[in-house]
């Protein structure tokens, strides 16, 4: 039951996560105009991943695409490629944790199947995270050295009377939601792992059948493993696996295709 | 059709307040900024402040700060402004103007003079 | 606060002339995000309100005759009236739409000669 719901729970959280990584790499401010000490401008300006926008007070907005590609900065280029592998990964990860959700019967897939496929989901999950984190991190970061570069030569004077004033860009809610939602995927990642281990069999290296003596229970391995004996609750615990058969134990505690978890 | 209409000239003492309005009609009041401007005898246009009738926020030209109060009846879509500790130097012609693309203003009201004499 | 300078401050000009009223401003009114000129220009009248001619420093307003233009960039801007008309004997001003506080320039007053 709570390895059921950690993954349901990583599902969910990862599902919320890449979501954010999606809104995130669309929305536009990723840097916004340093408003200083004024909170009210005439013109304010903010950028995204893909185009820049100029928003008048007069409520006038208007969009530029970047249409070229060689002639932007590599390190956009790197952080739109982080998104975008962000993207992708998670993407493939929420399809493959979709079939590994042990509450979803598909045919007759094995537990362990289920296992390698929670755990394939978790690590794209957390790949995932981290390719948003580094992403956004990368874009704060040439902010911050942007913005103390034009804080440096913020006003160039020009034959002494004439000032241009730089325009300065500060963190936009796109990097906050970048931040949070990569945190989510990542946390999701780490559910699913967790997860994983719980679905996983102990011993998977063999298959067995449980064999029953007319006098005591022994539960016979073939292939010169030892033996356990069914006494107490140890073949309780110990999941023996061969296709459809089961142990007797198991035919009464695990749920039948049919049932919903 | 667009128009902006302003309430009539007034005189007034110095230290005396006055309060200008300006009728908006033709268009949808709350989408757009309405800003004040005055112009004395002479002198060179001077903005004054400006107000959203949608989420009526404000702001003014520090030169006016604490003298002028911009406020709005949405209901009338009506706008006005509001002078006060008058001194002769504020004897002018005031404006109120819509906001368009580009930051410009493209509708004026008619004007209204205040005579701020003893 | 930008200030802005219009030369001259007064022109006399011949019908059917051009006329050239310029705008210096104290800042650049060039906003790098869109590479617009918050530049305005208005035209008035005695008696008048003013009455919006350009935007964006050379975008006309829909009305305003083609004989109306405008240019520049930066700190330097210019009205030009192609072919001067009766109708256009005016104060002519620049504002900058660029900045709080809007600021205007001190006018320029059209005439026939």
């Known amino acids: 039951m709570a390895v059921t719901a950690c993954q349901g729970l990583g599902f969910v959280v990862s599902l919320i996560g890449i979501a954010g990584i999606i809104a995130a790499t669309c929305m536009d401010q990723w840097s916004t105009q340093d408003l200083y000490n004024n909170p009210v401008t005439a013109v304010f300006n903010y950028q995204g991943l893909w185009r820049s926008c100029v928003r008048e007070s007069s409520g006038f907005t208007e969009c530029r695409g970047y249409f070229t590609l060689l002639g932007l900065p590599a390190m956009l280029q790197a952080v739109r490629a982080l998104m975008i592998v962000g993207i992708v990964l998670g993407a493939i990860g929420l399809l493959v944790s979709i079939f590994a959700l042990k509450c979803i019967r598909i045919g007759s897939m094995e537990d362990s199947a289920k296992a390698n496929m929670t755990l394939t989901s978790g690590i794209m999950f957390i790949v995932s995270g981290l390719c948003a984190i580094a992403g956004v991190s990368v874009f704060a970061n040439m902010l911050v050295t942007n913005f103390w570069m034009s804080t440096a030569n913020m006003y160039t004077g020009m034959g002494g009377m004439v000032q241009t004033v730089q325009t300065r860009y500060t963190f936009g809610a796109a990097l906050f939601v970048g931040w949070v939602a990569g945190g989510l995927t990542l946390i999701g990642g780490v559910m699913m792992c967790i997860a994983c281990r719980g679905l996983a069999p102990e011993e998977t290296n063999y298959k067995a059948v449980s064999y029953h003596a007319s006098g005591h229970s022994v539960a016979y391995k073939p292939g010169g493993f030892k033996a356990s004996t069914g006494f107490g609750s140890n073949t309780k615990n110990k999941k023996i696996y061969d296709g459809g058969a089961r142990t007797e134990d198991e035919v009464q505690s695990y749920p039948s295709k049919h049932d919903y978890v | 059709e667009v128009q902006l209409v302003q309430s009539g000239a007034e005189v007034k003492k110095p230290g005396a307040s006055v309060k200008v309005s300006c009728k908006a009609s033709g268009y949808t009041f709350t989408s757009y900024w309405m800003h004040w401007v005055r112009q004395a005898p002479g002198q060179r246009l001077e903005w004054m402040g400006m107000i959203h009738p949608n989420s009526g926020s404000t702001n003014y030209n520090e030169k006016f700060k604490g003298r002028v109060t911009l406020t709005l009846d949405k209901s009338a879509s009506t706008a006005y402004m509001e002078l006060s500790s008058l001194r002769s130097e504020d004897t002018a012609v005031y404006y109120c103007?819509?906001?368009?693309?580009?930051?410009?203003?493209?509708?004026w009201g008619q004007g209204t003079t205040v005579t701020v004499s003893s | 606060d930008i200030v802005l300078t219009q030369s001259p401050d007064s022109l006399a000009v011949s019908l059917g002339e051009r006329a050239t009223i310029n705008c210096k401003s104290s800042q650049s009114l060039l906003n790098s995000g869109n590479q617009k000129n918050y530049l305005t220009w208005y035209q008035q009248k005695p008696g008048q309100p003013p009455k919006l001619l350009i935007y964006w420093a050379s975008t006309r307003e829909s009305g305003v005759p083609d004989r109306f233009s405008g240019s520049g960039s930066g700190t330097d801007f210019t009205l030009t009236i192609s072919s001067l008309q009766a109708e256009d004997v005016a104060v002519y001003y620049c504002q900058n739409a660029y900045t709080y506080p809007f600021t205007f320039g001190q006018g320029t007053k059209l005439e026939i000669k």
């Open positions: 103007a819509r906001l368009k693309t580009g930051n410009s203003f493209d509708y």
